[in-house]
Interface confidence: medium
Amino acid sequence: ATKLTEEKYELKEGQTLDVKCDYTLEKFASSQKAWQIIRDGEMPKTLACTERPSKNSHPVQVGRIILEDYHDHGLLRVRMVNLQVEDSGLYQCVIYQPPKEPHMLFDRIRLVVTKGFSGTPGSNENSTQNVYKIPPTTTKALCPLYTSPRTVTQAPPKSTADVSTPDSEINLTNVTDIIRVPVFN
């Protein structure tokens, strides 16, 4: 049986979780993507999603979450900026491709955010907004009211996740270096 595992990431308040989820280009480039949290004893909750159809390199920001879908690279980038202790939890990246149930793109991420010095103003939202180079043309997208059931079972590819602090400008360089071969076929 193929059981999905968790990848643990321990970060400090004020830091950024930077996750790159790769997917099969031909199949899922324009499919809507979403970032979800799963709390113990609860169902998955969608925190943010791309537009439908998903637009290439077009940032979508919901609060402190920024999604960018790079069609050319088959890569969804998820950033959670100015992390807070309350952000700790289990997350997953999924693809909506009606009429199928969401595909999970990678092992779930167990995010642990702790208080501590990260070399930044930390929990002050206003001060970090000035440091981050978040594109001004962000769009809020409405997540789907529903998706239809999955009719096939597919194994998920891995993700890569990077950690950055508000000192560093967010950019996407050497993307080809971080893409792993997807399991989708």
Epitope: A1, T2, K3, L4, I38, R39, D40, G41, E42, M43, P44, T46, L90, Q92, Y96, P99, E101, P102, M104, R108, C143, P144, L145, Y146, T147, S148, P149, R150, T151, T153, A155
Partner: antibody, heavy 122, light 108 residues
Framework: QVQLQESGPGLVKPSETLSLTCTVS????????WTWIRQPPGKGLEWIGY???????NYNPSLKSRVTLSIDTSKNQFSLKLSSVTAADTAVYYC????????????????WGQGTLVTVSS | EIVLTQSPGTLSLSPGERATLSCRAS???????LAWYQQKPGQAPRLLIY???SRATGIPERFSGSGSGTDFTLTISRLEPEDFAVYYC?????????FGGGTKVEIK
């Protein structure tokens, strides 16, 4: 191909607790809604409840007071316990995999086990 | 809860004929969250149709579903010998999840 297999005692005494386990193979237990359904001999199907891998449960109100579902993701198994059974609980018990519409509470059942007959009798 | 009433209880037809099965809900089924299952003796139910009209993977084109609200239909355009079984409708739009009483399609 996803396969589900129910296991547990075929005979349970009245007032005791019925315990069944479903083992999932050929697929992940993560991100699905694992469901129990029963079918009394010669009758229709009745939904018992489901459990998600986070431990979230949803039960049929008619059975809620007697039902407990649990899940062990490390073993790819989920289980059903039905307490204070009577002859009316005699049925074929099925486990099934559920997929869920976003924002909804009830899953569609796309893969089923073969079922196991549980008889309640002294 | 939503009560699903299937009719007829038994349908006697010959191979090659068209079968029309009805499922009526006591109240509207939200977003057409209605499914059809086929069950043969000693076997588990098999998903045929979901979302009232979408065929599940591997289901032949002769099976089709239609309807919305409270009235739904499963049609088997041309019965094959392996199609003789019991068919159940199921709604999953409102708790609790419920099934119809079933329609038995038997060989005439």
């Amino acid at each position: 191909q996803v396969q589900l297999q129910e296991s547990g005692p075929g005979l349970v005494k009245p007032s005791e607790t019925l315990s069944l386990t479903c083992t999932v193979s050929g697929g992940s237990i993560t991100n699905y809604y694992w469901t129990w359904i029963r079918q009394p001999p010669g009758k229709g199907l009745e939904w018992i409840g489901y459990i998600y891998d986070s431990g979230y449960t949803n039960y049929n109100p008619s059975l809620k007071s007697r039902v407990t579902l649990s899940i062990d993701t490390s073993k790819n198994q989920f289980s059903l316990k039905l307490s204070s059974v009577t002859a009316a609980d005699t049925a074929v018990y099925y486990c099934a995999r559920g997929v869920l519409w976003f924002g909804e509470l009830l899953p569609l059942l796309d893969y089923w086990g073969q079922g196991t007959l549980v008889t309640v009798s002294s | 809860e939503i009560v699903l009433t299937q009719s007829p209880g038994t349908l006697s037809l010959s191979p090659g004929e068209r079968a029309t099965l009805s499922c009526r809900a006591s109240q509207s089924v939200s977003s057409s969250y209605l499914a059809w299952y086929q069950q043969k003796p000693g076997q588990a139910p098999r998903l045929l149709i979901y979302g009232a009209s979408s065929r599940a993977t591997g289901i032949p084109e002769r099976f089709s579903g239609s309807g919305s609200g409270t009235d739904f239909t499963l049609t088997i355009s041309r019965l094959e010998p392996e199609d003789f079984a019991v068919y159940y409708c199921q709604q999953y739009g409102s708790s609790p999840l419920t099934f119809g009483g079933g329609t038995k399609v038997e060989i005439k």
